[in-house]
């Protein structure tokens, strides 16, 4: 039975040209995290494997940095970066947990927000 929950930064905003840290946290489970995949809608941004470390997808290498921790830093933001981001936790023995973050990249200076929450499901 999957008892864990993913906490995320929820809905966040950042300025064009700036950077943002995407963070998720898995709690309420003793399952071992074997890998975390970071995805942007339909694209794979990066994989953090518990043993092997980080692999940043080649198309994002110039503006994605690993960390802090299991998080991901997006740099040189453009308005096209606005959208949904997902952290996918591969765990043993539970299976897969998914958290969602919505990023809005603003053209000019403006207020930012932080939220919480997330959801989880299991891939068979």
């Amino acid at each position: 039975m999957m008892t864990g929950t993913i906490e995320t930064t929820g809905q966040i905003s950042a300025e064009k040209g700036g950077s943002i840290i995407l963070q998720c946290h898995l709690s309420s489970t003793t399952a071992q995290v074997t890998q975390v995949n970071w995805e942007q809608q339909d694209q794979l941004l990066a994989i953090c494997n518990a043993d092997l470390g980080w692999h940043i997808s080649p198309s994002f290498k110039d503006r994605v940095a690993p960390g802090p921790g299991l998080g991901l830093t997006l740099q040189s933001l453009t308005v096209q970066d606005t959208g949904e981001y997902f952290c996918i936790y591969h765990t043993y023995p539970d299976g897969t947990y998914t958290g969602r973050i919505f990023l809005e990249v603003l053209e000019s200076s403006g207020g930012g927000g932080a939220g919480g929450g997330g959801h989880h499901h299991h891939h068979h």
Epitope: T34, D42, Q43, L44, D51, G53, W54, H123
Partner: antibody, heavy 121, light 107 residues
Framework: QVQLQESGPGLVKPSGTLSLTCAVS?????????WHWVRQPPGKGLEWIGY???????NYNPSLKSRVTISVDKSKNQFSLKLSSVTAADTAVYYC??????????????WGQGTLVTVSS | EIVMTQSPATLSVSPGERATLSCKAS??????VAWYQQKPGQAPRLLIY???YRYTGIPARFSGSGSGTEFTLTISSLQSEDFAVYYC?????????FGGGTKVEIK
């Protein structure tokens, strides 16, 4: 230039233990990367067996986990595979390979030439 | 376990022609796919990683494409040394799996 070379008995009896080593030249296996075993039954596709990371951690294919041990011999710059309780289904060409995860993800970029192991009495 | 299914099992092509090989994943693997070439009696050779990036020293006639569950390896103009078996592999999950292979033979 990194080179990998498998060695070990070409014939193992059923219920016995298959033991292979992979000698690595051109790179110290305790300096980086992960070091893998992959097998290929005659006329069939490839199956990942498991790896040892340079840090010493290991990870195995769940379907083989109960029978597999992969370890490193630092002094000889080689790593080994032990597969216990073998049956005819374990007859295959066994390859060792290197994975540069940071650059190429889970793709294996250097391979040994492979060694055929037959399980038969 | 993510199952990778390759088609066709055998592809007959004349030298100089284009070859298109297919690989389908049983679930979404984004772009975490590699392609290998294997000739008889030899080890696999890495061609493509991250679905579309050529490995060092691989000729430009080899190209990979796709995302999600459907992937393609294209050899634009087959040379005599390209007749071999080709395998796809996924590394989206922590248990890496390979396809069954496509044999490219001379027509």
């Amino acid at each position: 230039q990194v080179q990998l070379q498998e060695s070990g008995p070409g014939l193992v009896k059923p219920s016995g233990t298959l033991s292979l080593t992979c000698a690595v030249s051109g790179y110290s296996i305790t300096s980086g990367y992960s070091w893998h075993w992959v097998r290929q039954p005659p006329g069939k596709g490839l199956e990942w067996i498991g790896y040892v990371h340079y840090s010493g951690s290991t990870n195995y294919n769940p379907s083989l986990k109960s029978r597999v041990t992969i370890s490193v011999d630092k002094s000889k710059n080689q790593f080994s595979l032990k597969l216990s309780s073998v049956t005819a289904a374990d007859t295959a060409v066994y390859y060792c390979a290197r994975m540069d995860y940071g650059n190429y993800g889970g793709a294996m970029d250097y391979w040994g030439q492979g060694t055929l192991v037959t399980v038969s009495s | 376990e993510i199952v990778m299914t390759q088609s066709p099992a055998t592809l007959s092509v004349s030298p100089g022609e284009r070859a298109t090989l297919s690989c389908k994943a049983s679930q979404d693997v984004r772009t975490a796919v590699a392609w290998y070439q294997q000739k008889p009696g030899q080890a696999p050779r890495l061609l493509i990683y991250s679905a579309s990036y050529r490995y060092t020293g691989i000729p430009a006639r080899f190209s990979g494409s796709g995302s999600g569950t459907e992937f393609t390896l294209t050899i634009s103009s087959l040379q005599s040394e390209d007749f071999a078996v080709y395998y796809c592999q996924q590394y989206y999950s922590t248990q890496w799996t390979f396809g069954g292979g496509t044999k490219v033979e001379i027509k």
